[in-house]
Interface confidence: low
């Protein structure tokens, strides 16, 4: 599996999409997990509804939500109030029994606020002398990592 990069802005929500073959994964629940180390386990963050027919219902765990379009074949994960510590490797999974197939490997990168023109940690809007805790990009920029490319999340 290639790794797809999704970039979001600190404090904003980020949407991650994982397309899949709806026929191949018919009847299967899905999950979103965080990779613990390069070869470590993938720790479950949130999974779709226990009843597969209700997979379209959004389920939350803390600031992470999951919803599944089982007909269209798209799993969508929303990370609200994105923080630098959310950066890292994740997986979208299709569950069957105690097994899990990887649908997509995802690298989440957390960018500084796009309106933060200063080097300091304060988040700022152009023309302001005060700092504001500002954040706003749901503009999931996604790209695939090339083989051997080292992910370096540009966190601030």
């Amino acid at each position: 599996h290639n790794t797809t990069v999704f970039q979001g802005v600190a404090g904003q929500s980020l949407q991650v999409s994982c397309p899949y073959d709806s026929m191949k994964h018919w009847g299967r629940r899905k999950a979103w997990c965080r990779q613990l180390g390069e070869k470590g386990p993938c720790q479950r963050v949130v999974s779709t509804h226990n009843l597969w027919l209700l997979s379209f219902l959004r389920r939350w765990n803390g600031s992470t939500a999951i919803t599944d379009d089982t007909l269209g074949g798209t799993l969508t994960i929303t990370l609200r109030n994105l923080q630098p510590h959310d950066a890292g490797l994740y997986q979208c999974q299709s569950l069957h029994g105690s097994e899990a197939d990887t649908l997509r490997k995802v690298l989440v990168e957390v960018l500084a606020d796009p309106l933060d023109h200063r080097d300091a940690g304060d988040l700022w809007f152009p023309g302001e002398s005060e700092s504001f805790e500002d954040a706003h990009v749901e503009h999931s920029i996604s790209r695939s990592l090339l083989e051997g490319e080292i992910p370096f999340p540009p966190t601030s």
Partner: antibody, heavy 118, light 112 residues
């Protein structure tokens, strides 16, 4: 899919008022800064103002060209952005756009025409 | 206010060839953090502007890699390689360094 749909434009006499609206969908409206931008026929866009997100109290900034006459507000329960325009002048004739603000104006509505004429 | 000045394209560009659109700012848009706060937009005939480039050279989501931005603190270029019919329209640069945000007057791209 992000969608912005403006309404409320039309013909108004000099000195009159109009309230423009922008219905937003496809994203978490309260998380984003939103702007109004206008474009006179055949000319470049002009940024009018911005309203911050919920985390920053929906506070506003304006271009000096409209400050005191135009007011931006938002109804976050209905996902609607508003622009109240007062004491309109002939030079305010333009297409008015609402736009989402991220690294720039990443999504724009289709625009609504405001004509100020007697 | 920062004034943005755009140059005109002298002639219609032959389809398949490249086009370069220039923009100048009255003040450097290069910040001490290393980013240059210059955006590009395309407004196709009868449509709203579309976000193309931010931070001078970063393509917005979904924008073709035929579009590339470059420049210094005050002089900027948008290059469109292998122009196609869908590239026709008016291109605007915009400074994002300080309020009020200001746009250039626009550069019209026509194709032969």
């Amino acid at each position: 899919e992000v969608k912005l749909l403006e309404s409320g434009g039309g013909l108004v006499q000099p000195g009159g008022s109009l309230r423009l609206s922008c219905a937003a969908s496809g994203f978490t409206f309260t998380d984003f800064y939103m702007s109004w931008i206008r474009q006179p026929p055949g000319k470049a866009p002009e940024w009018l103002g911005v309203i911050r997100n919920k985390a920053n109290g929906f506070t506003t900034e304006y271009n000096t060209s409209v400050k005191g006459r135009f007011t931006i507000s938002r109804d976050y329960t209905q996902n609607i952005l508003h622009l109240q325009t007062n004491t309109l002048r002939a030079e305010d004739t333009a297409i008015y756009y609402c736009a989402r603000l991220t690294y720039g104006f990443d999504y724009w509505g289709q625009g609504v025409m405001v004509t100020v004429s007697s | 206010d920062i004034v943005m000045t755009q140059g005109a394209l002298p002639n219609p560009v032959p389809s398949g060839e490249s086009a370069s659109i220039t923009c100048q700012s009255s003040k450097s848009l290069l910040h001490s953090n290393g980013k240059t706060y210059l955006n590009w937009y395309l407004q196709r005939p009868g449509q709203s502007p579309q976000f193309l480039i931010y931070w001078m050279s970063t393509r917005a989501s979904g924008v073709s890699d035929r579009f590339s931005g470059s420049g210094s603190g005050t002089d900027f270029t948008l290059k469109i390689s292998s122009v196609e019919a869908e590239d026709v329209g008016v291109y605007y640069c915009q400074q994002f360094l300080e309020l009020p945000f200001t746009f250039g007057s626009g550069t019209k791209l026509e194709i032969k």
